[in-house]
Interface confidence: low
């Protein structure tokens, strides 16, 4: 499991003649947002085919109005990363589609209108856990600059996020600071730790302890935008240390917009700008239909008669979720018996059995006593996935090979003295006491 992350650096007119000044106009202010679609492998798939690795939609960028006669500035972009979680192995080779959408905010009846400005696509090789890769793509007269990476979510590690790194109970053969890895237990994994506090959104590192900034960010921890004023918001009390106004609570605090909607403040309240497929005051109403192709992983879309949904996805085996977007967690059904560890490898389930059990689902209880002898007249006892010896008097240890001192546990009560005897132990009781263990 892991996350593919995309950072858009800039979108605007490309170099050369005939480039458009701006996607927005003085008459129609607009703002941009982006959609990324990921597919495994290097196939030239149609844009409409399912985003089998996942898809993500950015927040809306700030509103932009072209000023006639003014030089075209860089277009304001949405904040933050586009993140596409993946549940299984990272394929290493993948195809991507990045769409730039324009949301026109004119006075048209019925709210904002959306239009696709540019679509870029590419095929890449990328190892998980590597540094940010930079890219420039052109679509017609537009140019898009971006960075991307794939990172594993613990406990997954490795270039495909398929190795699980968990501390083992056995002493580690790995050096200091290295973690032992399962299932390849002879491998050791060195965690790449950036400088403490390095921004996870705007910073990255290729060496332990460093913090390198993505374009547009600066500072030792990459937390400072390159060209921002020192003061934040004109709302709230003034800070004694900076003299700047500290933001007080606002209508967008806690983001009242559902389903990935972005919130912007209005003079009286707030306004949600909803992603495609959602609408309503808080983006709470779904407007996705089968025409939008909402079913992933080969799911079949039918118009829902159920009043709670405008469509229903019939998912193929192995997938679930309202959009067939989730691979069925087959391990949640606990198919491995007798305490076996379940591993969902995507193409198959694997059970790692505890000692004493075997079979595809650890269903076979091995004969723990087969070939196991207990010394000195001890008897082998089955159970718990490991053999156990019930030892004859005077012997102990796993195989009854150790001579036991029956007096070691001080069995004689009330100050009685213990004597080891071939048949066991004998207690010589203190005056006034009696019984086999001087208990009376």
């Amino acid at each position: 499991a892991g996350v593919f992350e995309l950072q858009i650096h800039s979108f605007g007119p490309g170099p050369g003649p005939g480039a458009p000044r701006s996607p927005c106009s003085a008459r129609l202010p607009c703002r941009l947002f982006f959609r990324v679609c990921l597919k495994p492998g290097l196939s030239e798939e149609a844009a409409e085919s399912p985003c089998a690795l996942g898809a993500a939609l950015s927040a809306r960028g700030p509103v932009y109005t072209e000023q006639p006669g003014a030089p075209a500035p860089d277009l304001p972009l949405p904040d933050g990363l586009l993140q596409v979680p993946f549940r299984d192995a990272w394929p290493g080779t993948f195809s991507f589609i990045i769409e730039t959408w324009r949301e026109e905010l004119g006075d048209q009846i019925g709210g904002p209108a959306w239009s696709l400005l540019a679509r870029v696509a590419g095929r890449r090789r990328l190892a998980a856990g590597g540094p940010w890769a930079r890219d420039i793509q052109r679509a017609g007269a537009w140019e898009l600059r971006f960075s991307y990476r794939a990172r594993c979510e613990p406990p997954a590690v490795g270039t495909a996020c398929t190795r699980l790194c968990r501390p083992r109970s056995a002493p580690s053969r790995c050096g200091p600071g290295l973690r032992p890895c399962a299932p390849l237990e002879d491998e050791c994994e060195a965690p790449l730790v950036c400088r403490a506090g390095c921004s996870p959104e705007h910073g990255f590192c290729e060496q332990p302890g460093e913090c390198r900034c993505l374009e547009g960010w600066t500072g030792p921890l990459c937390t400072v935008p390159v060209s921002t004023s020192s003061c934040l918001s004109p709302r709230g009390p003034s800070s004694a240390t900076t003299g700047c106004l500290v933001p007080g609570p606002g209508p967008c605090d806690g983001n009242p917009c559902a389903n990935g909607g972005s919130c912007s403040e209005t003079p009286r309240s707030f306004e949600c700008t909803c992603p495609r497929g959602f609408y309503g005051l808080r983006c709470e109403v779904s407007g996705v239909t089968c025409a939008d192709g909402p079913c992933f992983n080969g799911g079949l879309c039918v118009g829902g008669a159920d009043p709670d949904s405008a469509y229903i996805c019939h998912c193929p085996p192995g997938f679930q979720g309202s959009n067939c977007e989730k691979r069925v967690d087959r391990c949640s059904l606990q198919p491995c018996r007798n305490g076996g560890l379940c591993l969902d490898l995507g193409h198959a389930l694997r059970c790692r059995c505890r000692a004493g059990f075997a079979g595809p689902r650890c269903e076979h209880d091995l004969d723990d006593c087969a070939g196991r002898a207990c010394a000195n007249g001890g008897t082998c006892v089955e159970g718990g996935g490991a053999h156990r010896c019930s030892c004859a008097l005077g012997f102990g240890g796993r195989d009854c090979r150790e001579r036991a001192d029956p007096c070691a546990a001080r069995p004689c009560a009330h100050g009685g003295r213990c004597y080891a005897h071939f048949s066991g132990l004998v207690c010589a009781c203190a005056p006034g006491y009696m019984g086999a263990r001087c208990e009376f």
């Epitope: 609408y279 109403v285 025409a291 118009g303 829902g304 008669a305 469509y311």
Partner: nanobody
Framework: QVQLAESGGGSVQAGGSLRLSCVAS???????????MAWFRQAPGKEREGVAA????????SYADSVKDRFTISKDYANNTLYLHINNLKPEDTAMYYC????????????????????WGQGTQVTVSS
Amino acid sequence: QVQLAESGGGSVQAGGSLRLSCVASGYPSSTYYMLSMAWFRQAPGKEREGVAAITSGTGSTSYADSVKDRFTISKDYANNTLYLHINNLKPEDTAMYYCAAASGWIVPSRSLTANLYRYWGQGTQVTVSS
């Protein structure tokens, strides 16, 4: 992109009847029933108000209290057309009538809320004289 075109408005005497039509185009006929649709009206100097709605999938209908028992909304799926049958017209029904659509299911209790609809027609004028 869905386009909506209304027709059927006109001038009538109080107590008369009209049938307004709204043809939806630019949307696959096979999924036309997925559109939630509604009629709104706006009288001069007043706010737009929802009068009748029909939700997708279930086809359940909702009406404003002021028009109940006089207005009937219906959908002709074969011709991608929404209708509003108006009986016993009153002078206060005078307004511009707009057809609106949304590509999805809308909670019936909120189906007369204008900002839930993404697509709008240009409107047809209804004038009722006493």
